[in-house]
Amino acid sequence: MRTEAQVPALQPPEPGLEGAMGHRTLVLPWVLLTLCVTAGTPEVWVQVRMEATELSSFTIRCGFLGSGSISLVTVSWGGPNGAGGTTLAVLHPERGIRQWAPARQARWETQSSISLILEGSGASSPCANTTFCCKFASFPEGSWEACGSLPPSSDPGLSAPPTPAPILRADLAGILGVSGVLLFGCVYLLHLLRRHKHRPAPRLQPSRTSPQAPRARAWAPSQASQAALHVPYATINTSCRPATLDTAHPHGGPSWWASLPTHAAHRPQGPAAWASTPIPARGSFVSVENGLYAQAGERPPHTGPGLTLFPDPRGPRAMEGPLGVR
């Protein structure tokens, strides 16, 4: 778990100014110390997708990336706890699952991830910009909540190609540019040598591309990995609002568990026994480094170039912490 490490405070830089390299070098030991101290910080992920098969149908998937055991998961929409959120489903590893309309099917996927199929029509139908939140109560970490919504660029009418690699940052472009010039110089010299000696030079194609290939892989995920992490989207109606469900279910205590089937009262061997619907076999999922499980064999994403806020074109694996294979 994280302990409070004293890290020197950096004042907000002036717009457009970068910190001096020397200053950053001095800070590096502190950064490394902080990284060691905070390696156990848990993370929550939320994935929101529209189903291609049915109109106004959403699939919400949530996962907890931490060392603790999950004791309760609460899924809500309309905002997080304390900001007008309305509970859609509560999943307990021992006492089972309870869900409220328009939630259709809530289930455990793994011991630390759940999925919820949501559908509705008219007033109870979710919007494309609806916020869905998942709150994980775990021991010993405590309670952690994360929210997500459908990406604004997910236009179901368009079959977009895989997300292109982003425009290279200036410093990276400079490095690649210099490398390219040097590479071109080497190729040119070899070409001159070949002409001078009147014999064929060794194949240069691999050396022409190899210095840039690893960097390109780091910037853009493969089509295969993207295809395994996305599903097609479908149109949903726009007349939508989170239904006022607070009167439909109690918030005060665990008494509602009494209405669950009695077979859910004992602790099962695995997540499959927790849910009212069976979990697909473990082999039908691909395990991704960041703990995100996705069905294999899906189409490339519908994430076109119109993302407006902070899209990460490098895919879910980018910039994640030490997330072991689950």
């Epitope: 950053r24 950064v31 939320v46 994360a146 929210c147 996305h230 994430t303």
Partner: nanobody, 127 residues
Framework: QLQLVESGGGLVQSGGSLRLSCAAS????????MGWFRQAPGKEREFVGR??????????SYADFVKGRFTLYGNQARNTVYLQMNSLKPEDTAVYYC??????????????????WGKGTLVTVSS
């Protein structure tokens, strides 16, 4: 350039709630990760939480002191990030800063490497 403007701070009683907003404008498409930091009087600036988008998936992490009291979420269409703070304590009194982080930023590295900062909004929790 990327401009970040925080709002929603103010005075609140212990145990109360506040929602901070951070509106991003300008070069938003070049950023991938947003975070919140805070700096209490006479203390170092510390990481509160960060949110990262990747396709249809949102990743969120928090500092340990949050302990389920805060929720970080965003509205991509509106270029806005929110920090919902519940069960506030007097020790949560601080200036809260919104930050835009580069895609290769490690959120656990405190305020090191932050590219853009907002001016901050003051949150005062009275006992």
């Amino acid at each position: 350039q990327l401009q970040l403007v925080e709002s929603g701070g103010g005075l609140v009683q212990s145990g109360g709630s506040l929602r901070l907003s951070c509106a991003a404008s300008g070069r938003t498409r070049s950023m991938y990760v947003m975070g919140w930091f805070r700096q209490a009087p006479g203390k170092e600036r510390e990481f509160v939480g960060r949110i990262k988008w990747s396709g249809d998936t949102t990743y969120t992490s928090y500092a340990d002191f949050v302990k389920g009291r805060f929720t970080l979420y965003g509205n991509q269409a509106r270029n806005t990030v929110y920090l919902q703070m519940n069960s506030l304590k007097p020790e949560d009194t601080a200036v809260y800063y919104c930050a835009a982080l580069p895609s290769d930023y490690d959120y656990r590295a405190a305020s090191y490497g932050v590219d853009y900062w907002g001016k901050g909004t003051l949150v005062t929790v009275s006992s």
